[in-house]
Interface confidence: medium
Amino acid sequence: IWELKKDVYVVELDWYPDAPGEMVVLTCDTPEEDGITWTLDQSSEVLGSGKTLTIQVKEFGDAGQYTCHKGGEVLSHSLLLLHKKEDGIWSTDILKDQKEPKNKTFLRCEAKNYSGRFTCWWLTTISTDLTFSVKSSRGSSDPQGVTCGAATLSAERVRGDNKEYEYSVECQEDSACPAAEESLPIEVMVDAVHKLKYENYTSSFFIRDIIKPDPPKNLQLKPLKNSRQVEVSWEYPDTWSTPHSYFSLTFCVQVQGKSKREKKDRVFTDKTSATVICRKNASISVRAQDRYYSSSWSEWASVPCS
Amino acid sequence: RNLPVATPDPGMFPCLHHSQNLLRAVSNMLQKARQTLEFYPCTSEEIDHEDITKDKTSTVEACLPLELTKNESCLNSRETSFITNGSCLASRKTSFMMALCLSSIYEDLKMYQVEFKTMNAKLLMDPKRQIFLDQNMLAVIDELMQALNFNSETVPQKSSLEEPDFYKTKIKLCILLHAFRIRAVTIDRVMSYLNAS
């Protein structure tokens, strides 16, 4: 048993039929010695009396909010949560495995630039009685500070018969230098509580590996005289690290016909303009990627040819 | 990215072209190592990230773009001093900081060159003959060092009398290649920045 936060405790339980469970001793936080009684959740049934209460925790029915009282007055609370371990493996029932980029990916994170700011998100099919708390640091043995906000519900999607909920959190490394060469990874730890079930999820990464620039901005077409060619121009996204001559991007320009089956023409360039042939009903798209470290491409920015 | 690329002219700055070749070569070598040594811990998640130049050079600090010198977090130490006569410097643009930066890059390359050559000598003794260093990568390091053209004492190649542990050598190769790729990215950024300045 360990303390998650004030008056909230996590009991680690071996989860199999007829498992012996864990013996837990609760102590009432009071100077009083006599006349103390204990109840669980909303029930008025007295579970025991005295300053301490010993319970055998085996299942979710044994978890919950234990309250000690004296003469009708509440003295203190202890909330017991369960962390299930099935044959040596912690349960991962609350979050959905996103399977991208590999199996067992419960948390996914992205950064728009090298400022030390990043966003992580996760998916669940659970809609109520759900809380998350997020902690992060750079390195684990001598951790350096990373500050995370509160996790919020960022999207809802319908997947077949199920509703899927996406939660996200923004974090910022306390003292980040965009030009630094990372040698210690960022660690992100998410505590998830659903009703009386506790689970924890972790992710470890270098900012350089989770970079995904915003799409190029101000995408414009300029027709070239007496030609089917157009000059496409764009700018670096506002959110990209500066100076741009140091944090350079490379771009992919694509001409795509109306039909997905039509052949795509692609050109790669380090410049912020390109000359392409604009077909009728086609559209021109541009996306960006760090020029020197091949992390993710941005989403496409597009304009119609007409 | 084996597709048509509209490449800019190398411009007036001769080292830019060499640094781009360097990044390409080290990235290819790292990819080859990860494929060949697939049953060794060779991915970014599996290795310990070590920097052999730590406390010996200060490339990130010395080559910091002017715009980032206002960022407190970027200014750890900028005290290292180096020789100042690089041929990549267009003479009118020569500044103390720029010379310091380029000489720091030169020292990095020299250290990695020694490590890679020592390692290659060990790998050539491996009866499995599983992996060797790409000669192109070693040549590209040499070319960039020549273009930087700093006078510096030559570092003797380390030799070891004991029987090499090939497993450890291959893991060290992965660690070295990962670190060198990160440094090659920094070098490329620096050259691009200096070229635009």
Partner: antibody, heavy 114, light 107 residues
């Protein structure tokens, strides 16, 4: 109440094989199922586990070449690909390796040889 | 992955003697440790789970204990039938690993 592994045989390097673990007189529904192997004259090696809800966890060396599945409430399979001579071993399945009532099968021998 | 370092790799004892086998976990695994006994040609048999809980039918001469990340199996009053190889199994909550094993010979 017993578990029995089957499917072990001689296979050539590079080949594939699927082992099955069948329960008789007991249910696998409320338990995790684990595969463990033991090379001749060597120690036990934990390979991976399939949880009650189907969650899969593998030893890092087993990731990719070995796949555990639960095709029914009484069987658990272990699919092995790209076999090498190093995979020659007795393969055991076990119900609940950390529980007091842990049950193991007698094992099935897989020999990889050309 | 958690690494379990088991010592010694082999040991011997006279009938009635005491044997101590240790397992060191490379990281904190709390009490998630089991001890197994294996005799030639047989599958392993669980002796102790959760570091110190004896499984049913196992004689009380077997005792498991824990100090930090070091786990100990003590056999007091060794019997002839205790000749076997003993393994620890530890789990960090994501994967498990066996120790290298300890072969016990009865003199």
């Amino acid at each position: 109440q017993e578990l029995k592994e089957s499917g072990g045989r001689l296979v050539t390097p590079g080949g594939s094989l699927t082992l099955s673990c069948t329960a008789s007189g007991l249910t696998l529904g409320s338990y995790s199922m684990t595969w463990v192997r033991q090379a001749p004259g060597k120690g036990l090696e934990w390979m991976g586990v399939i949880g009650v809800g189907g969650t899969l966890n593998y030893a890092s060396w087993a990731q990719g070449r070995f796949t555990i599945s639960k095709p029914s409430s009484t069987t658990v399979d272990l699919k092995m690909t790209s076999l090498t001579t190093e995979d020659t071993a007795t393969y055991f399945c076990a119900r609940g390796t950390y529980s007091g009532d842990s049950i193991w099968g007698p094992g099935t021998l897989v020999t990889v040889s050309s | 992955d958690v690494v379990m370092t088991q010592t010694p790799s082999s040991t011997s004892a006279a009938v009635g003697g005491t044997v101590t086998i240790k397992c060191q976990a490379s990281q904190s695994i709390s009490s998630w440790l089991a001890w197994y006994q294996q005799k030639p040609g047989q599958p392993p048999k669980p002796l102790i789970v959760r570091a110190s809980i004896l499984t049913s039918g196992v004689p009380s001469r077997f005792k498991g204990s824990r100090s930090g990340t070091e786990y100990t199996l003590t056999i007091s009053g060794v019997q002839r039938e205790d000749a076997a190889t003993y393994y620890c199994l530890g789990g960090d909550g994501h994967v498990s690993n066996f120790g290298g094993g300890t072969e016990l010979e009865i003199l």
